[in-house]
Amino acid sequence: VEVQVSEDPVVALVDTDATLRCSFSPEPGFSLAQLNLIWQLTDTKQLVHSFTEGRDQGSAYSNRTALFPDLLVQGNASLRLQRVRVTDEGSYTCFVSIQDFDSAAVSLQVAAPYSKPSMTLEPNKDLRPGNMVTITCSSYQGYPEAEVFWKDGQGVPLTGNVTTSQMANERGLFDVHSVLRVVLGANGTYSCLVRNPVLQQDAHGSVTITGQPLTFPPEA
């Protein structure tokens, strides 16, 4: 028996369902009574789900997994994982045994989009050219860790005096805070981009300082 899985990682959004595809080619006359199917975590060997002795043995993994029972006889051994969590990320191995056995591993990459950044300024009043200001760009509830970029109003990257911190909450999602310290010119726009490297999702915010008052332009 030959087991086939997708080579590319399966990308699943947090709180959605994911299908880990696995298939085999049954011989003519194949019956489910001959099938032993095991899904397990590749690294720890923890049992996730199994089908043995002609029947679905159910989920051994937080009761969030299911097979496609009507499709098993056609060689579809895919696993459905419900309400994906950050902790589900990793490699899963599909073992299929009929007379001989084969196995293959599929990777699950979990992702969550970042919120539109909010921009804050300190100090936020009585600003004059030459003042040092701290601009903070905050974006929330994303996964995995973000890439953060700053640009000035002419599209030129700002790399000096940037400090970025990322903290995971109890669900494993990251809140990003990036701080840019700049000396004000007569006026200027400062833009922050928070990129999710898995989803290739960009979220950006900007602040424009034109003497007084400060403006936070709407996103185009």
């Epitope: 000035d152 002419q154 599209g155 996103e219």
Partner: antibody, heavy 121, light 106 residues
Framework: EVQLQQSGPELVRPGVSVKISCKGS????????MHWVKQSHAKSLEWIGV????????YYNLKFKGKATMTVDKSSSTAYMELARLTSEDSAIYYC??????????????WGAGTTVTVSS | DIVMTQSPVIMSASPGEKVTMTCSAS?????MHWYQQKSSTSPKLWIY???KLASGVPGRFSGTGSGKSHSLTISSMEAEDVATYYC?????????FGSGTKLEIK
Amino acid sequence: EVQLQQSGPELVRPGVSVKISCKGSGYTFTDYSMHWVKQSHAKSLEWIGVINTSSGNTYYNLKFKGKATMTVDKSSSTAYMELARLTSEDSAIYYCSKYYGSSFHWYFDVWGAGTTVTVSS
Amino acid sequence: DIVMTQSPVIMSASPGEKVTMTCSASSSVSYMHWYQQKSSTSPKLWIYDTSKLASGVPGRFSGTGSGKSHSLTISSMEAEDVATYYCFQGSGYPLTFGSGTKLEIK
């Protein structure tokens, strides 16, 4: 009409430096950054770097760090790029280009005619 | 770096023929921009923000795409379209261009 006027062709010896210029007209020079792009037969179009024409803040392609230095003279609305320690690999046409856009959404809307630099002994 | 791969490298089309060239980015880009360069001249902005035609560009040109895959199409080839077309991404530094598609006429 927005124009970028570049300095004339340069024939220089290996090991020396050359400074080429790009004068902007027809727009507010200090409102837009200036980029430099190299075009050679071997590598097509390569982005060298950018300068903020108001603050002088620069950002370079790592490949050209130490090779190119960008400066600006606001009073004459002119951007400069100096290329150091020239070798035959630096023989190319160098374009300045004006960057247009907002936030993280940019493109080159106007290009200079190009300055041909030939490095030969 | 975001690598931009253009194909084909060279193509030839008859007058009136539909022409499509593609640009594939190694990472997703928010917008793709295209430049036309005729021999011995500087590049000209041709298509910006993936699908918007620059001033003076004939309506037979169009741009489409999203993410990693983008294309430029000419609905009906004309002699004046002979040039090299470069795709360009401004989504991430360093800024990068494709290696160009040279369009010739049969």
